[in-house]
């Protein structure tokens, strides 16, 4: 597993470093999760040919993965810090069930999958501290999540490989958009 944020070996080059600010810590946490996703994607791509599948073919899946839209206030035009932060936190909470699904999908990267899941929980906590309007954040229904998880795990092998690939790709894209938006806050 990669080195957790705050223990980055690269930091050695910067002595007398002040403690990380909240924004820097969040930035670093996202980078850490992206590293984990990268490792998981490597295993997925080595195992199947999903990574070569065209975006059009992949778009036909029926997964309801979180995605940034104009109305979420995370883009430059119509940027709204509060609306956007709510979207990021809500999106990450929605991704949690999919990250749970990933837990039994990896052989050599099992530890990495767990690290991505746990690091995302930490990221959510960081962001919740930053949010002023926590009431606007809707937590996914546990019963709905449980039945979704059962449904995903009951798919055939090909669909499970496809689902794994889609989750990793969508999560990476969501984090990249979140990273840019958070730098605007």
């Amino acid at each position: 597993a990669p080195v957790p944020p705050g223990e980055d070996s690269k930091d050695v080059a910067a002595p007398h470093r002040q403690p990380l600010t909240s924004s820097e810590r969040i930035d670093k946490q996202i980078r850490y999760i992206l590293d984990g996703i990268s490792a998981l994607r490597k295993e997925t791509c080595n195992k199947s040919n999903m990574c070569e599948s065209s975006k059009e073919a992949l778009a036909e899946n029926n997964l309801n993965l979180p995605k940034m839209a104009e109305k979420d206030g995370c883009f430059q035009s119509g940027f709204n810090e509060e609306t956007c932060l709510v979207k990021i936190i809500t999106g990450l909470l929605e991704f949690e069930v999919y990250l749970e699904y990933l837990q039994n999908r990896f052989e050599s990267s099992e530890e990495q999958a767990r690290a991505v899941q746990m690091s995302t929980k930490v990221l959510i906590q960081f962001l919740q501290k930053k949010a002023k309007n926590l009431d606007a954040i809707t937590t996914p229904d546990p019963t709905t999540n449980a039945s979704l998880l059962t449904k995903l795990q009951a798919q055939n092998q090909w669909l499970q490989d496809m689902t794994t690939h889609l989750i990793l790709r969508s999560f990476k894209e969501f984090l990249q958009s979140s990273l840019r938006a958070l730098r605007q806050m």
Partner: antibody, heavy 126, light 110 residues
Framework: EVQLVESGPALVKPTQTLTLTCTFS??????????VSWIRQPPGKALEWLAR???????FYTPSLKTRLTISRDTSKNQVVLIMTNMDPVDTATYYC??????????????????WGQGTMVTVSS | EIVLTQSPATLSVSPGERVTLSCRDS???????LAWYQQKSGQAPRLLIY???NRATGIPARFSGGGSGTDFTLTISSLEPEDFAVYYC???????????FGQGTKVEIK
């Protein structure tokens, strides 16, 4: 190999509109985290960032020139275009396009310009 | 508006010497947005350091970056003849991503 090449007129008259094109190869601007910016440098002076366009077509401009600038892209041609209206002699500079730093292994992007074009000199004079 | 101050404006040094360039800003900036560039006469700038202390691809180990808050440094441990150039620091301020560049430090042969 990643490359960026700027093209446009060497000379424009005051009040005219400048159109610059950045043609790139070796990467796709649709890749998550990818971004191309325009930066200029008047002769003997420091660098000045102008505009940026991101992987999902989100656009950013330097506040002082926002009303004069338009950045756009053509992903099929691998090009980014900058339009700057109402040119003035103070806009005489070398104009560069640059790709933002992205760690290709994980898609993490840093706010730094990793790869630059060679630049194109634009003189504003009547 | 945040202003980046680079010092000194010019530095006269001999090859083999250790050089430390300073970049100071009027407000505290994020370490994830501080970068250093090298520009030789008639050429485009080249990224040396990003995120305060990470060396860009292909940059020799003699270049290192550090600092936090309002004070950042670029150190060249032992100056090579090809290192004589102008060095710029840059960072991002609000509204994001407003890139601000310093005025540059010229490193010339003594």
């Amino acid at each position: 190999e990643v490359q960026l090449v700027e093209s446009g007129p060497a000379l424009v008259k005051p009040t005219q509109t400048l159109t610059l094109t950045c043609t790139f190869s070796g990467f796709s601007l649709s890749t998550g985290g990818m971004s191309v910016s325009w930066i200029r440098q008047p002769p003997g002076k420091a660098l000045e960032w102008l505009a940026r366009i991101d992987w999902d077509d989100d656009k950013f401009y330097t506040p002082s020139l926002k009303t004069r600038l338009t950045i756009s892209r053509d992903t099929s041609k691998n090009q980014v275009v900058l339009i700057m209206t109402n040119m003035d002699p103070v806009d005489t500079a070398t104009y560069y396009c640059a790709r933002m730093h992205i760690d290709d292994s994980n898609g993490y992007f840093s706010d730094a310009f990793h790869i630059w074009g060679q630049g194109t000199m634009v003189t504003v004079s009547s | 508006e945040i202003v980046l101050t680079q010092s000194p404006a010019t530095l006269s040094v001999s090859p083999g010497e250790r050089v430390t360039l300073s970049c100071r800003d009027s407000q505290s900036v994020s370490s994830t947005s501080l970068a250093w560039y090298q520009q030789k006469s008639g050429q485009a700038p080249r990224l040396l350091i990003y995120d305060t202390s990470n060396r860009a691809t292909g940059i020799p180990a003699r270049f290192s970056g550090g600092g936090s808050g309002t004070d950042f440094t670029l150190t060249i441990s032992s100056l090579e003849p090809e290192d004589f150039a102008v060095y710029y620091c840059s960072f991002v301020s609000r509204p994001y991503p407003r890139f601000t560049f310093g005025q540059g430090t010229k490193v010339e042969i003594k």
